[in-house]
């Protein structure tokens, strides 16, 4: 028996369900009751799911996973995962044994997509060319970790004097701020994109500074 | 009539080199996983290692990892143990079976043995 | 130490029935299934149950075989005199990814 599983990571969203494709190729005459599935956390071993003596046994992981029964008999071992959560990620192993045994293992990436970003200024008030100002990008609630990326008015990278921390709430997910501490010029656009590298998507903020008032 | 017929046992010293066969008949063996048990003098089974049926997936017990080797040679229909760095503790008959439903081995040969003594 | 745990010895007279237990945990027997392999003096093992219950072809049906959560056991009824043996539990185990046989139980028909 060969098992087979993507090659690709599964890429799953927070708080939507994920399928791990794990298939195998039965044997003419094969039937259920020969069939022992396994379904396991590859790096600790730790159980998740198992389909033996001709019976679903049920989830053995949070009570969030299922097979699916009607697909089995035609060699479709794939594991549903609901309502994923960060501590999910990982790599997870299909064991198959029937009268031969194999295994593979997929991959699951977990994402969440950050927030528009919102800009802050300090000073915010009586600001004139040649004044120091902070500016901080703050964008919530994504997976993985961001990368952050300011520009000015013309597209040029701003690399000195950006801060940038990400902290994690207890759901795992990132708050990332980032400061950039900038001379004025007589006006200007400064801009901040967050980026999640899983789901190449990029929220943008910005803040243009043109004597009063503030544009943001 | 299926049958496994193990050899290739004897006694070394510790320290030494075995390669224990296994020639099968009587089922397709190409079709089915296989494995190795063993059986120290007056012990119960502990089993050995596992090979599926094209030797891609391959599992061994912990109290032999990195020093044995189990392989197969479909074409031959014969499994194969290799046994490195021997330890008095590996005294043992050797098991050669045969893959079967839900994690059973429904075939077992008559067994080969294996004496490592100084 | 065996993963799965067997009583060393068991007895019974004949015509009676004895069973044998044997309890592993969710990883194994909970997660999967149960074998049973019976062991003649000085003869190789020989498959007597799997899949907990099912006998394969030849195995009188006084053998039977049971599964309960994370434990299960061996029962023969009618005991016989050529029924004095070694018996073995197995199982896969999930969290070590190796399969684990029980210590053995040695029955002595009396």
């Known amino acids: 028996v060969e098992v087979q599983v993507s090659e690709d990571p599964v890429v799953a969203l927070v708080d939507t369900d994920a399928t791990l494709r794990c298939s195998f190729s039965p044997e003419p005459g094969f039937s259920l009751a020969q069939l022992n599935l396994i379904w396991q956390l590859t790096d600790t071993k730790q159980l998740v799911h198992s389909f033996t003596e001709g019976r679903d046994q049920g989830s053995a992981y949070s009570n969030r996973t299922a097979l699916f029964p009607d697909l089995l008999v035609q060699g479709n071992a794939s594991l549903r995962l609901q309502r994923v959560r960060v501590t999910d990620e990982g790599s997870y192993t299909c064991f198959v044994s029937i009268q031969d045994f194999d295994s593979a293992a997929v991959s699951l990436q977990v994402a969440a997509p950050y927030s528009k970003p919102s800009m802050t200024l300090e000073p915010n008030k009586d600001l004139r060319p040649g004044n120091m100002v902070t500016i901080t990008c703050s964008s919530y609630q994504g997976y993985p970790e961001a990368e952050v990326f300011w520009k000015d008015g013309q597209g040029v990278p701003l690399t000195g004097n950006v801060t940038t921390s990400q902290m994690a709430n207890e759901r795992g997910l990132f708050d990332v701020h980032s400061v950039l501490r900038v001379v004025l010029g007589a006006n200007g656009t400064y801009s901040c994109l967050v980026r999640n590298p899983v789901l190449q998507q990029d929220a943008h903020g910005s803040v243009t500074i043109t004597g009063q008032p503030l544009t943001f | 009539e299926v049958q496994l017929l193990e050899s290739g046992g004897g006694l070394l010293q510790p320290g030494g080199s075995l390669r224990l066969s296994c020639a099968a008949s009587?089922?397709?063996?190409?079709?089915?996983?296989m494995h190795w048990v063993r059986q120290a003098p007056g012990k119960g089974l502990e089993w050995v290692a596992a090979i599926n049926s094209d030797g891609s997936r391959i599992y061994y017990a912990d109290s032999v990892k990195g020093r044995f080797t189990i392989s197969r040679d479909n074409s031959k229909n014969t499994l194969y143990l290799q046994m490195n760095s021997l330890r008095a503790e590996d005294t043992a008959v050797y098991y050669c079976?045969?893959?079967?439903?839900?994690?059973?081995?429904?075939?077992w040969g008559q067994g080969t043995t294996v004496t490592v003594s100084s | 130490q065996s993963v799965l745990t067997q009583p060393p010895s068991a007895s019974g007279t004949p015509g009676q029935r004895v069973t044998i237990s044997c309890s592993g945990s969710?990883?194994?027997?909970?997660?999967?299934?149960v074998n049973w392999y019976q062991q003649l003096p000085g003869t190789a093992p020989k498959l007597l149950i799997y899949?907990?219950?099912l006998r394969p072809s030849g195995v009188p049906d006084r053998f039977s075989g049971s599964k309960s959560g994370t434990s299960a056991s061996l029962a023969i009824s009618g005991l016989q005199s050529e029924d004095e043996a070694d018996y073995y539990c197995?199982?896969?185990?999930?969290?070590?990814?190796?399969?684990?046989f029980g210590g053995g139980t040695k029955l002595t028909v009396l």
């Open positions: 197995a199982s896969w185990d999930a969290s070590l990814n190796t399969w684990v």
């Open positions: 899949q907990s219950h």
């Open positions: 969710r990883s194994d027997i909970g997660a999967t299934t």
């Open positions: 009587g089922f397709s063996f190409s079709s089915y996983g």
């Open positions: 079976t045969k893959y079967y439903y839900h994690y059973a081995m429904d075939v």
